[in-house]
């Protein structure tokens, strides 16, 4: 089930997922001057069975200069500005992505993809927060957020993180040592 809202915004912090739950969708966005190939996929979709998960469909971009009637997927300047802060941060490759059952790893980049990735998360997804460069993390609890569903409405839990303006950055979990995150929670309705 798709999360119909976004992970919370924490001042001076960014978030990312270590792995993506089955059902997660990634928009096939192209950088400026390029567009999705005609009849190309709109999304990549994390799918799988009990033993293996992988991304279905491939995103492919082609130069907008070539004549084609397909509508451009590349955002126009105004739209580009809006999209900068949407859904997920830039396509970074986490150092460690534990092989959780029912999860996909970060998809590899495709040629001429947009600078920002737009993910559509599903219920049960967990994202991790870290302070941006120049800010230090003050933890009151886990620096993570989970998408939960209650009464048919989705919401993200509030990460217990404050970023204070002192040099020294914290790391995402798993960037020090490999570990499985407690992300594979059942995708069930939270009791009302």
């Amino acid at each position: 089930e798709l999360c119909d809202d976004d992970p919370p915004e924490i001042p001076h912090a960014t978030f990312k997922a270590m792995a993506y739950k089955e059902g997660t969708m990634l928009n096939c966005e192209c950088k400026r001057g390029f567009r999705r190939i005609k009849s190309g996929s709109l999304y990549m979709l994390c799918t799988g069975n009990s033993s293996h998960s992988s991304w279905d469909n491939q995103c492919q971009c082609t130069s907008s200069a070539t004549r084609n009637t397909t509508k451009q997927v590349t955002p126009q300047p105004e739209e580009q500005k809006e999209r900068k802060t949407t859904e997920m941060q830039s396509p970074m490759q986490p150092v460690d992505q534990a092989s959780l059952p029912g999860h996909c790893r970060e998809p590899p980049p495709w040629e001429n993809e947009a600078t920002e990735r737009i993910y559509h998360f599903v219920v049960g997804q967990m994202v991790y927060y870290q302070c941006v460069q120049g800010y230090r993390a003050l933890h009151r609890g886990p620096a993570e957020s989970v998408c939960k569903m209650t009464h048919g409405k989705t919401r993200w839990t509030q990460p217990q993180l404050i970023c204070t303006g002192e040099m020294e950055t914290s790391q995402f979990p798993g960037e020090e040592k490999p570990q499985a995150s407690p992300e594979g929670r059942p995708e069930s309705e939270t009791s009302c």
Partner: antibody, heavy 116, light 106 residues
Framework: QVQLVQSGAEVKKPGSSVKVSCKAS????????MHWVRQAPGQGLEWIGY????????EYNQKFKDKATITADKSTNTAYMELSSLRSEDTAVYYC?????????WGQGTLVTVSS | DIQMTQSPSTLSASVGDRVTITCSAS?????MHWYQQKPGKAPKLLIY???NLASGVPARFSGSGSGTEFTLTISSLQPDDFATYYC?????????FGQGTKVEVK
């Protein structure tokens, strides 16, 4: 209480455009996505797309990507959907519906009739 | 896109009847949601996440199913229940609805 109030019925000529509004009250407008759904006469429901009022980000059903443009005005708690290059097939009732999961609140619907 | 196929399209029934509407998804989905619509009115949320009744919905309505096959049941049809019912998936974009099942007076 939560309310979504849509603009009145419109009659338009083929080739023209129309902008339907949906004014939200009773909740924090920027906390929920606003979705739009179409229902042609005697037909079922079709999802058009949504907007995140907080950021202006939109996601569309590919079928309506060239037809609909969804916007929002945070200052007036109003979402808009503009339909361009109208054709007779665009005659339908258009609904806004509050997101954040299932559509628990709907506007009353706006009938757009395209006729020469 | 995930196609949603409801059956039957029209159902003729009498007050007191037990009514069952099925909805089949072209791919496996997490949950099914159901809406009720009366002529000239906006749809109304009836059942969410397959089996949970929306606020104010009578207990004669129930939902079940998993994967690709889902069911809406009205245990004893009441006069207020004559309407059109739509199943809905929001497991993947584009969000899709079934074509509707009209429950009419026999």
């Amino acid at each position: 209480q939560v309310q979504l109030v849509q603009s009145g019925a419109e009659v338009k000529k083929p080739g023209s455009s129309v902008k339907v509004s949906c004014k939200a009250s009773g909740y924090t407008f920027t906390s929920y996505r606003m979705h739009w759904v179409r229902q042609a006469p005697g037909q079922g429901l079709e999802w058009i797309g949504y907007i995140k009022p907080s950021r202006g980000y939109t996601e569309y059903n590919q079928k309506f990507k060239d037809k609909a443009t969804i916007t929002a005005d945070k200052s007036t708690n109003t979402a808009y959907m503009e339909l361009s290059s109208l054709r007779s097939e665009d005659t339908a009732v258009y609904y806004c519906a509050r997101g954040g999961g299932v559509f628990d609140y709907w506007g009353q619907g706006t009938l757009v009739t395209v006729s020469s | 896109d995930i196609q949603m196929t409801q059956s039957p399209s029209t159902l003729s029934a009498s007050v007191g009847d037990r009514v069952t509407i099925t909805c089949s998804a072209s791919s496996s989905i997490s949950y099914m949601h159901w809406y009720q619509q009366k002529p000239g009115k906006a749809p109304k949320l009836l059942i969410y996440t397959t089996s949970n009744l929306a606020s104010g919905v009578p207990a004669r309505f129930s939902g079940s199913g998993s994967g690709t096959e889902f069911t809406l049941t009205i245990s004893s049809l009441q006069p207020d229940d004559f309407a059109t019912y739509y199943c809905h998936q929001r497991s993947t974009y584009p969000l899709t609805f079934g074509q509707g099942t009209k429950v009419e007076v026999k």
